[in-house]
Structures are given as structure tokens and as C-alpha cells.
């Protein structure tokens, strides 16, 4: 899978994580920080 950094317009897309652009899948993906989940890392879990 080809990946690159997300475009600058996606700054802030991932609330608690790193945004990665999955080129072949035509979508952005959030790699969440520890303790966070959700498509955009918006949920905190203990």
C-alpha cells in the first residue's frame, strides 16, 4: 500500500493522532495516539 502524509487541508482532521494518506485506497487514515480511538481519534478510552 502506497502511503504519504496528508495534504495541508487535512491539518486537524485527526484529533489525537497522525494523519496518513492511503494513496491506493483514496482515503485519509488516522493513526491514533495511545488511549484514543475512532475514525478521527476522537474518543478517549481508559
Amino acid at each position: 500500500v502506497s502511503i504519504t502524509k496528508c495534504n495541508s487541508d487535512m491539518n486537524g482532521y485527526c484529533l489525537h493522532g497522525q494523519c496518513i494518506y492511503l494513496v491506493d485506497m483514496s482515503q485519509n487514515y488516522c493513526r491514533c495516539e495511545v488511549g484514543y480511538t475512532g475514525v478521527r481519534c476522537e474518543h478517549f478510552y481508559l
Partner: antibody, heavy 116, light 106 residues
Framework: QDQLVQSGAEVKKPGASVKVSCKAS????????IQWVRQAPGQGLEWMGR????????KRREKFEGRVTITADTSTNTAYMELSSLRSEDTAVYYC?????????WGQGTLVTVSS | DIQMTQSPSSLSASVGDRVTITCKAS??????IAWYQQKPGQAPRLLIQ???TLQPGVPSRFSGSGSGTDYTFTISSLQPEDIATYYC????????FGGGTKVEIK
């Protein structure tokens, strides 16, 4: 399957406002950005602005500042674009477009006609 | 705002010809360019994103290349069903469409 269903065609008088809706099904708009694009008859595509429904923040093209309002209701999974002070050159097909989780998934378009 | 200058605005070519459309950005857009095909009365159809990544179901005669500010879209062998208007879109910093290129058959 994922869908963006827009509201029906509108006819408005100059100076009036129009509010176009864009209802998502099959996915949560909070996971995406919703963009708005328009196309006047026989003309090119023009990006108007977008909303991040999760945060509620918007970005607009400078020429539309003060005239376009983009909102989202996450409880109904619907985005809205309201354009005020309509003039004849606002006659166009208005599209909502999903981006973020999937690159550019388009609604079917809404024709807005401005005529006295 | 980033400006996208697309050329030519229209072209006429024969079936089987190689067709090339260019888009020049007013600043580096880091390969974040997409190409759309639009036929009359239809919504635009995404052909290519991230400069050269073909979308599923799009024929291999369509291709894209470029970097920095200069990008190219190519139809290697024009077919009758390719008659349409083509648009570039930069999506690095917000979004800007090129002015479009109307492709006709000679």
C-alpha cells in the same frame, strides 16, 4: 451503500436566500469533511467551501465570504449550504462532496435558478 | 488561494490520437492533484487522484504525471466515449479547479 442525497431544485428571486441540504446515509458525516462545489450553466466547476462536521469549523472561498453559510447537523447526518443575496449569476447546479475517509464522493446535485 | 491554470481550454483530435492536457499551479501542491471527466448533464467522474493513481474501473489509456507546480493528464489513444470536458483539481490547500478542457473529435 454510501449515499449523499441532496434536496430538490429551487427557483428564487434576486436578493433572496436558498438553503440546500445534503443528507448522508451509509456513513457518519462526523468522519468526513463535506465540500460544496457549484457549476453555472455551460461553465466550469467552482469550489465554494467546506465544513468539518465534527468540529463545526468551516472554510470558504474568499469571494463567498459573508454570503455563504455552511452548517451540519450531526444528529440527522445532514450538511447544509445557504447562499444569500442571490443574483442571476448564482444560477447553477450545487453539489455536496464527501472527502476525508474517501476521496470525493459526490451528491447528485441541486439546480438553483435565480430569476425575477 | 492557489490558482490552477489549465490548458488548452478546448481541443479537437482524431480517434486514436494522443491527447495531453496541462495544469499549472500558482505554488507547489505536493502532487495533490486530481483529474475529472464530465459529460453533459452528468456529475463529474473522478479518474485520477494524487497525480497518477487511477481510480478503479478507469481505463488504462488515462494517465497523469507531474510534481511541484506542473502536471499533465494524458489520454494515450482517444476513443469516441472520451468526448467530455476534463478538469484538474488541486486539493493540497483547500480546493481549486482548473478552468476545464473540452475534448472533441475531429
Amino acid at each position: 451503500q454510501d449515499q449523499l442525497v441532496q434536496s430538490g431544485a429551487e427557483v428564487k428571486k434576486p436578493g433572496a436566500s436558498v438553503k440546500v441540504s445534503c443528507k448522508a446515509s451509509g456513513f457518519n458525516i462526523k468522519d468526513t469533511y463535506i465540500q460544496w462545489v457549484r457549476q453555472a450553466p455551460g461553465q466550469g466547476l467552482e469550489w465554494m467551501g467546506r465544513i468539518d462536521p465534527l468540529r463545526g469549523n468551516t472554510k470558504r472561498r474568499e469571494k463567498f465570504e459573508g454570503r455563504v453559510t455552511i452548517t451540519a447537523d450531526t444528529s440527522t447526518n445532514t450538511a447544509y449550504m445557504e447562499l444569500s443575496s442571490l443574483r442571476s449569476e448564482d444560477t447553477a447546479v450545487y453539489y455536496c462532496v464527501r472527502s476525508g475517509t474517501l476521496f470525493d464522493f459526490w451528491g447528485q446535485g441541486t439546480l438553483v435558478t435565480v430569476s425575477s | 488561494d492557489i490558482q490552477m491554470t489549465q490548458s488548452p481550454s478546448s481541443l479537437s483530435a482524431s480517434v486514436g490520437d494522443r491527447v495531453t492536457i496541462t495544469c499549472k499551479a500558482s505554488q507547489d501542491i505536493h502532487k495533490y492533484i486530481a483529474w475529472y471527466q464530465q459529460k453533459p448533464g452528468q456529475a463529474p467522474r473522478l479518474l485520477i487522484q494524487y497525480t497518477s493513481t487511477l481510480q478503479p474501473g478507469v481505463p488504462s489509456r488515462f494517465s497523469g504525471s507531474g510534481s511541484g507546480t506542473d502536471y499533465t493528464f494524458t489520454i494515450s489513444s482517444l476513443q469516441p466515449e472520451d468526448i467530455a470536458t476534463y478538469y484538474c483539481l488541486q486539493y493540497d490547500n483547500l480546493r481549486t479547479f482548473g478552468g476545464g478542457t473540452k475534448v472533441e473529435i475531429k
